[in-house]
């Protein structure tokens, strides 16, 4: 028995070959012997039953001369899954058609971090098929009647080529995923005390009408609990602020990409925030983490100090050096100091290896007097 796979809504071609490789009389039947179609010697396709009953069934007349008499079934339905019989040259050939339906849950447009379940349904009790989907960038996921893709990323968007294999027979189908998310899952902003701060939250997708609501929660390093800094609505890509904290005095841009500004970086604002965006008609939320690190260099009496506040990695080095000289002090800590600094332009550096994340300069005029 030959096996043919077909996807619901598409077409399937059931083979029937003559050993003579020439035109001959043939008939396609259902397993209950009802005639579907055939050719009875005049090269004319004869259909069984009423036209409306069998209008989805056809054959390839152009292939008959070569001894090929396929049964074409268009707009496949689940109930087409059954055995079909081709009668020719005093023999019967049985062809098993397995029609499967693909469902995507919760759909093919998802939010970053969500999971997609692809399910193959069929009326026939077939053994487990192998389902494999491959992204154009090379990522492969496989399963059987159920295929799961968890923790989806923006880069998982686009076309996936999927194959269903059963008894070495293959059927192809495609799916286009749209994973909505921010371009970056996390970002960090380094600022000297008093500098303006800008946070940008670019989305990694574009849609004509983008509607939803969002909020930025902030956990300052110095604070015991987090606080809502701003809530906003998004309507057709227009941002409108609903509620904003009075300290800091935040401003938010009215158009995408989502953008926030703080008039100045202060130690009490250093910390990390979580921007959440809930989109209309989508379950779940998009998240982006943002971190603010603030640096301050000061001189009090005989002590030159450099401090950083906010979420810094343990491998970051904080240094104090007189310009164009070797570092006087360098530590993997959040504060460094020099006692009785000599006069000149001092530099405080926060660095990751040889990459400087930020620096602050302070002019020491003479021991005990300074000017930033």
């Amino acid at each position: 028995k030959t096996l043919v796979l077909g996807k619901e809504g598409e077409s399937a071609e059931l083979p029937c070959e003559s050993s003579q490789k020439k035109i001959t009389v043939f008939t396609w039947k259902f397993s209950d012997q009802r005639k579907i179609l055939g050719q009875h010697g005049k090269g004319v396709l004869i259909r069984g039953g009423s036209p409306s009953q069998f209008d989805r069934f056809d054959s390839k007349k152009g292939a008959w001369e070569k001894g090929s008499f396929p049964l074409i079934i268009n707009k496949l339905k689940m109930e087409d899954s059954q055995t079909y019989i081709c009668e020719l040259e005093n023999r019967k050939e049985e062809v098993e058609l397995w029609v499967f339906k693909v469902t995507f849950s919760p759909g093919t447009s998802l939010l970053q971090g969500q999971s997609l379940t692809l399910t193959l349904d069929s009326n026939s009790k077939v053994s487990n098929p192998l389902t494999e989907c491959k992204h154009k960038k090379g990522k492969v996921v496989s399963g059987s009647k159920v295929l799961s893709m968890s923790n989806l990323r923006v880069q998982d968007s686009d076309f996936w080529n999927c194959t269903v294999t059963l008894d070495q027979k293959k059927n192809w189908f495609g799916m286009t995923l749209s994973v909505l998310g921010f371009q970056k899952a996390s970002s960090i902003v380094y600022k000297k005390e008093g500098e303006q701060v800008e946070f940008s939250f670019p989305l990694a997708f574009t849609v004509e009408k983008l509607t939803g609501s969002g909020e930025l929660w902030w956990q300052a390093e110095r604070a015991s609990s987090s606080k809502s800094w701003i809530t906003f609505d998004l309507k057709n890509k227009e941002v409108s602020v609903k509620r904003v904290t009075q300290d800091p005095k935040l401003q938010m841009g009215k158009k995408l990409p989502l953008h926030l500004t703080l008039p100045q970086a202060l130690p009490q604002y250093a910390g990390s925030g979580n921007l959440t965006l809930a989109l209309e008609a989508k379950t779940g939320k998009l998240h982006q983490e943002v971190n603010l690190v603030v640096m301050r260099a000061t001189q009090l009496q005989k002590n030159l100090t450099c401090e950083v506040w906010g979420p810094t990695s343990p491998k970051l080095m904080l240094s104090l050096k007189l310009e164009n000289k070797e570092a006087k002090v360098s530590k993997r800590e959040k504060a460094v100091w020099v006692l009785n600094p000599e006069a000149g332009m001092w530099q405080c550096l926060l660095s990751d290896g040889d990459k400087v994340k930020m620096d602050s300069r302070i002019q020491v005029l003479s021991r005990g007097v300074n000017q930033t």
């Epitope: 401003q251 009215k254 953008h259």
Partner: antibody
Framework: EVELLESGGGLVQPGGSLRLSCAAS????????MSWVRQAPGKGLEWVSG????????YYADSVKGRFTITSDNSKNTLYLQMNSLRAEDTAVYYC????????????WGKGTTVTVSS | AIQMTQSPSSLSASVGDRVTITCRAS??????LGWYQQKPGKAPKVLIS???SLQSGVPSRFSGSRSGTDFTLTISSLQPEDFATYYC?????????FGQGTKLEIK
């Protein structure tokens, strides 16, 4: 060609009310955000109020908040500014302006209508 | 509200001169700033949007730039028709705010 024509200006006593209209032609009104901008005699430009294309979001300068109301009637392609509790400092030429598709700038302006608040 | 500080408030120059007008924003406003020209008794006209995008029909002698929260309008070679008042406008967020204006006069 897109054109904006303001009307409804005039002389009004302090504490009085006026309704300004801005009739638009040559555009699909509901697509664009609109604004009212004023200019007091011999002074600079002051943004007064704005409304989103959908008409759902309205915005005001602090100087007029609670006294002025911006609305639009998409079926009539008309923008309105209802001005209540008028003060002498509201005396100005009032311009209506259409914003670009992505709120980039005010690309079309009306010729203005004069409002004088005086006893 | 975001404050826009425009300078100078007035400027005398001659035809052919290179002129710069500056606006400083009290907050970061990305590139969401436009420059407008107004002649006496007329409505304002947009010259530049989004900091540096020259509007169609505006001569190329007009240009805009940004450094942090400082925005500059430059007229490379003044023409007689350029004598007018110039305003910057932040449209980053509501309420929008104009600069105080710069009156450009013939020296």
């Amino acid at each position: 060609e897109v054109e904006l024509l303001e009307s409804g200006g005039g002389l009004v006593q302090p504490g009085g009310s006026l309704r300004l209209s801005c009739a638009a032609s040559g555009l699909t009104f509901s697509t664009f955000a609109m604004s009212w901008v004023r200019q007091a005699p011999g002074k600079g430009l002051e943004w007064v109020s704005g409304i989103s294309g959908s008409g759902e979001n309205t915005y005001y300068a602090d100087s007029v908040k609670g006294r002025f109301t911006i609305t639009s009637d998409n079926s009539k392609n008309t923008l309105y500014l209802q001005m209540n509790s008028l003060r002498a400092e509201d005396t100005a030429v009032y311009y209506c302006a259409k914003e670009g598709y992505n709120w980039n700038y005010m690309d079309v302006w009306g010729k203005g209508t004069t409002v004088t608040v005086s006893s | 509200a975001i404050q826009m500080t425009q300078s100078p408030s007035s400027l005398s120059a001659s035809v052919g001169d290179r002129v710069t007008i500056t606006c400083r924003a009290s907050h970061g406003i990305r590139n969401d700033l436009g420059w407008y020209q107004q002649k006496p008794g007329k409505a304002p006209k947009v010259l530049i949007s989004e900091t540096s995008s020259l509007q169609s029909g505006v001569p190329s002698r007009f240009s805009g730039s940004r450094s942090g929260t400082d925005f500059t309008l430059t007229i490379s070679s003044l023409q007689p028709e350029d004598f007018a008042t110039y305003y910057c406008l932040q449209d980053y967020t509501y309420p929008y705010t104009f600069g105080q204006g710069t009156k450009l006069e013939i020296k």
